[in-house]
Amino acid sequence: LSLEAPTVGKGQAPGIEETDGELTAAPTPEQPERGVHFVTTAPTLKLLNHHPLLEEFLQEGLEKGDEELRPALPFQPDPPAPFTPSPLPRLANQDSRPVFTSPTPAMAAVPTQPQSKEGPWSPESESPMLRITAPLPPGPSMAVPTLGPGEIASTTPPSRAWTPTQEGPGDMGRPWVAEVVSQGAGIGIQGTITSSTASGDDEETTTTTTIITTTITTVQTPGPCSWNFSGPEGSLDSPTDLSSPTDVGLDCFFYISVYPGYGVEIKVQNISLREGETVTVEGLGGPDPLPLANQSFLLRGQVIRSPTHQAALRFQSLPPPAGPGTFHFHYQAYLLSCHFPRRPAYGDVTVTSLHPGGSARFHCATGYQLKGARHLTCLNATQPFWDSKEPVCIAACGGVIRNATTGRIVSPGFPGNYSNNLTCHWLLEAPEGQRLHLHFEKVSLAEDDDRLIIRNGDNVEAPPVYDSYEVEYLPIEGLLSSGKHFFVELSTDSSGAAAGMALRYEAFQQGHCYEPFVKYGNFSSSTPTYPVGTTVEFSCDPGYTLEQGSIIIECVDPHDPQWNETEPACRAV
């Protein structure tokens, strides 16, 4: 059965939907099982950002190696995408040092190796090196290693303090180590450098050098101080034995790129900066750089998380003899997750996992129906996302509530205004042998011809116990049915609107009183089922005080059990 749309005009009853104890939406067909198959070759990481309540789901999924719970990849896993050259454009130009225009980030130079079956973090991958078979022609103020033919120029930084560690589950593709970088006039060489030499006794020696990418900056840049990291974890250490010009401080950049679907977590293990030195951390890979921290925030033990798969750290030091200061940071990749889905007003959400492949299921409170997807799946992406918008719970216009024990009936749109030209009918039916108590939480009708009728029976002709046309004041004690039914009727005309109504109901056994209720308060009872003789004592939440009614009420009259006093109300102090 499905709820029909509210009928236009008065006197027409809409379709009525039967439910068992709870009014819900007409069953929306479940979204078909998605065709997306979640596949990944990303390794299992110790996750640091999971919701504590979800621990059992995550751990279970990781132990199983369940592909459904691993991040979904919309592409074949290649090594982490190289940086596009837009690093840190928004960092403040501190101390009037040259604004960063680093030549280093786009690392097209590195040869691509076929993926091993271990995946993108295969521990077997090797550091790429640039093989130089002839001396490069020196450019203006270029610091170039002078090598003989056949020598290998390692791109590993001069001090082991800058080498990315590979302590984790292997390398993420390859440790994209720093390439040849420039100083002085700022000519950066990146790309594949190939040289060929032809020589003979009588021939002139010819050297051909191809430089694929050349970036030229016209400002005087600090020393060669830029590294790229792309393993799942590594160490970022301050440079210690860089030979740099005596009149310039360091301006160093550490670029971290982990697998899409992961974020970068940086932990400060040690930091000791000199006056005037700065360290700034930004998240990259999103639409805009995301400032994450600076030296004033970077204290020992501090953890900074980039919600994107790329991050950059910039260190600016003083010129000798004063500097530089030192630091030791450790970074690691952490699995990104979807945001916790918003709980719909008048509904709830159950989440299996916030990580890609996880799902969120929504349902609505009695009297509301779900508008939108009942089931969302977390999809993998650079920033994982839910595959649909969060649904909302909309108040239904009418319905049948069988086995009504406790719940609420609310008018369409509540707590917002109802619409015009509605005729909504609700039938409440208590379990066999029980009666109903109906309590008015709120009734707000437009002054014109909008009308709420509550009938003591199961049909539109049953005599009313409340009719807004005829009754000026709401009974604070609520209403009791003489049998097991209440029939609620809301009709609105073509003009004016108000918030409508919220009615709370509860069933109670014959020979018993109904369960008391106090908003913004609580009560204790001498007996849980409220037979004759039960006493109930009320109290209010902090900031509220008891008004009207009595603090203690008693269930009296064996022939027609009822509370001897009305329930009190708790009002804000």
């Epitope: 009313p464 005829e470 009754v471 000026e472 004041y473 009974p475």
Partner: nanobody
Framework: HVQLVESGGGLVQPGGSLRLSCAVS????????MAWFRQAPGKEREGVAV????????YYADSLKGRFTISHDNAKNSLYLQMNSLRAEDTATYYC?????????????????WGQGTMVTVSS
Amino acid sequence: HVQLVESGGGLVQPGGSLRLSCAVSGFTSSRGWMAWFRQAPGKEREGVAVIGRRSGDIYYADSLKGRFTISHDNAKNSLYLQMNSLRAEDTATYYCAVGDQAGHVLTSSPYRYWGQGTMVTVSS
């Protein structure tokens, strides 16, 4: 000060008819219920019929439908009960009541004001 005065009761033979009237004064609300109740000797008071002042909605006790008719005249502020095909079991004191509170309209709970009653006897 609200006052209700019933009239029209008396002795009638089975199968006969009677028309009861209730003059209401002091009740100025445009809304509320106006009802007829009856109480037979040795029995509890029971609702006979009710009419809404604003809505004009009418409700009867199940056992009486078809024989009794309730009506009211707003201009005269009067309530009427037309009783046809009277039976011996209709013998009772008939009361007029008005009220604007919530409650089962065919029970006494919504009614704040009551008349003194008029006696109807159905006997041959």
